[in-house]
């Protein structure tokens, strides 16, 4: 009787977990005469088989990741080797099982990171990989810090996004690391399959040795300037210094004044771009940004401060 | 020495039936199969079927079933193809061709060609 | 079905001459094919079968070769009987079928 086990020549789809030995029969297709006889072709592996009458099986356990659908064809032949029906495809799909674990591509990572950088961005990335499907729990990866030394007020300085293994600083990090007072630390990373989420779960740990490097993006001392220079403009009076190449550099009035008397380069120099009088405006407060190719800040601003100091040039009123 | 003897030329009207003959001989008649093949003038060989003598058993190219029927006579080791409601697309020469049953399936002795021409 | 093509159509070739002629399947066929000689009168004869195998009683001069798809006959050095039709028929699943022909004339 036809039914799940048995029946005609006709393209079929099996799902047969990996890893297991074989403990039944795929399927039994019935010959319609002159057929007498079957055979199978395409990716067997040697592993599936059909016997003459029609039987097909397997004869060892699958791995999926050496091969995740195997395509075959099955055609009935009659008593002469002529094909008389198909061939027609038959699709065997490899279903995943846990039995890779994950690995860390290096057992050892090295980075550095500007004290003060913005909580939450990257500035390293630990990658692990995972032979098994990743479309199922099993190679669903799971990053976690496991260890990080020192430990100073059982704060944690840095954070790991879960699944893509991006290391960034949290927002006490980013306030209190201090190359000054702890150049070096040391995290011990682990990544878990099943998303972490099983107790039968495989994992893998590695080492991270981060470096803090100073943050030069540091407001200037405030700037003395005499008041009706009759040096040529513009002259230069303080500069910025963002902590990478490539910077683009503006001021900001947030005074919004009629004339704004300074300007900085790329190279975040800040000129004074006329003489100024004390007698109009004593003191200037504005601000140096710092952006990205695509313009966006790259951190917070920094104040700048320009105090004018008198010169003899009112004679006495009554 | 095997040979496959077939019966002469035939002219036959539209519409009529006619059959053709192959008769064997050097060689026991039901071990192998009876191929026949068609060819139209100027043209190239077309497989129409066959027929196993021992269990009279045929499988025929779907292209000429209805139009082709094949049985044998055991008795005189001859085996007949019956070509039914002739058009002028049958005239052609036609062959019987010994098939070695099993595999390899070839055509190992042929007929010498029965012409057929179908004209009113 | 199995279309098999086969090139020349026809081709003029002198005695003692090499040649080899071309039959392709439109799809995989296993081997399973031979070749025939049709000569002038009509009779029809195997020269080889299931790709390789030269069948008995012909000369050595004919040989076949081929796997999957591609398929050829070659005649080492052409003698005057030699000069015929030429057909190859794939056997590997129904309808048999058997290419156009290749005929093969005295220059």
């Known amino acids: 009787q036809e039914g799940k086990f048995s029946g005609p020549l006709k393209p079929m789809t099996f799902s047969i977990y990996e890893g297991q030995e074989p403990s039944q029969i795929i399927f039994q297709f019935k010959a319609n005469p002159p057929a007498v006889t079957f055979e199978l072709t395409g990716e067997t592996d040697n592993i599936f088989v059909i016997e003459r009458e029609g039987l097909l099986y397997y004869n060892r356990a699958l791995d999926r990741e050496t091969r995740s659908t195997h395509n075959l064809q099955v055609a009935a032949l009659d008593a002469n080797g002529i094909i008389v029906e198909g061939p027609v495809p038959i699709t065997i799909k490899v279903k995943d099982i846990n039995d890779n674990r994950p690995t860390f591509l290096q057992s050892k990572y090295e980075g550095s990171v500007r004290q003060n950088s913005r909580p939450g961005k990257p500035f390293l990335y630990v990658n692990a990989t995972d032979l098994d499907d990743p479309a199922t729990p099993n190679g669903q990866l799971y990053y976690q810090i496991v260890i990080q030394l020192p430990m100073i007020n059982n704060v944690m300085y840095f954070q790991i996004n879960n699944k893509t293994g991006a290391i960034s600083l949290t927002r006490e990090g980013s306030q209190e690391l201090n190359p000054a007072k702890n150049p070096s630390y040391n995290l011990v990373i682990s990544v878990k399959d099943m998303g972490g989420q099983s107790e039968n779960s495989f994992s893998d740990t590695t080492s991270v040795d981060i470096i803090v490097t100073e943050n030069i993006w540091k407001a200037p001392k405030p700037v003395e300037m005499v008041e009706n220079s009759t040096d040529p403009h513009p002259i230069k009076i303080t500069q910025v210094r963002w902590n990478d190449p490539g910077a683009q550099y503006s001021l900001v009035d947030k005074e919004k004044l009629p004339r704004f008397p300074f300007s900085i380069d790329q190279e975040g120099d800040i000129y004074v771009t006329q003489p100024l009088d004390r007698e109009e405006k004593d003191a200037y407060v504005f601000y140096a940004v710092a952006k990205d190719e695509y313009g966006k800040p790259l951190s917070y601003p920094l104040e700048i401060h320009v105090k004018v100091k008198d010169i003899n040039d009112n004679p006495p009123t009554c | 020495q095997v040979q496959l003897q077939q019966s002469g030329r035939d002219l036959v009207k539209p519409g009529a039936s006619v059959k053709i003959s192959c008769k064997a001989s050097g060689y026991t008649f039901t071990d192998y199969h009876i191929n026949w093949v068609q060819q139209r003038p100027g043209q190239g060989l077309e497989w129409i079927g066959w027929i196993f003598p021992g269990s009279g058993s045929t499988y025929y190219n779907e292209k000429f079933k209805g139009k082709a029927t094949l049985n044998v006579d055991k008795s005189s080791s001859t085996a007949y193809m019956l070509l039914s409601s002739l058009t002028s697309e049958d005239s052609a020469v036609y062959f019987c061709?010994?098939?070695?049953?099993?595999?390899?399936?070839?055509?190992?002795?042929w007929g010498q060609g029965t012409t057929l021409t179908v004209s009113s | 079905d199995i279309q098999m093509i086969q090139s020349p159509s026809s081709m003029f070739a002198s005695l003692g001459d090499r040649v080899s002629l071309s039959c392709r399947a439109s799809q995989g066929i296993r081997g399973n094919l031979d070749w025939y000689q049709q000569k002038p009168g009509g009779t029809i004869k195997l020269l080889i079968y299931s790709t390789s195998n030269l069948n008995s009683g012909v000369p050595s001069r004919f040989s076949g070769s081929g796997s999957g798809s591609d398929y050829s006959l070659t005649i080492s050095s052409l003698e005057s009987e030699d000069f015929a039709d030429y057909y190859c028929?794939?056997?590997?699943?129904?309808?048999?079928?058997f290419g156009a022909g290749t005929k093969l004339e005295l220059r």
């Open positions: 028929l794939q056997r590997n699943a129904y309808p048999l079928t």
């Open positions: 061709a010994r098939g070695k049953s099993g595999y390899p399936f070839y055509f190992d002795y």
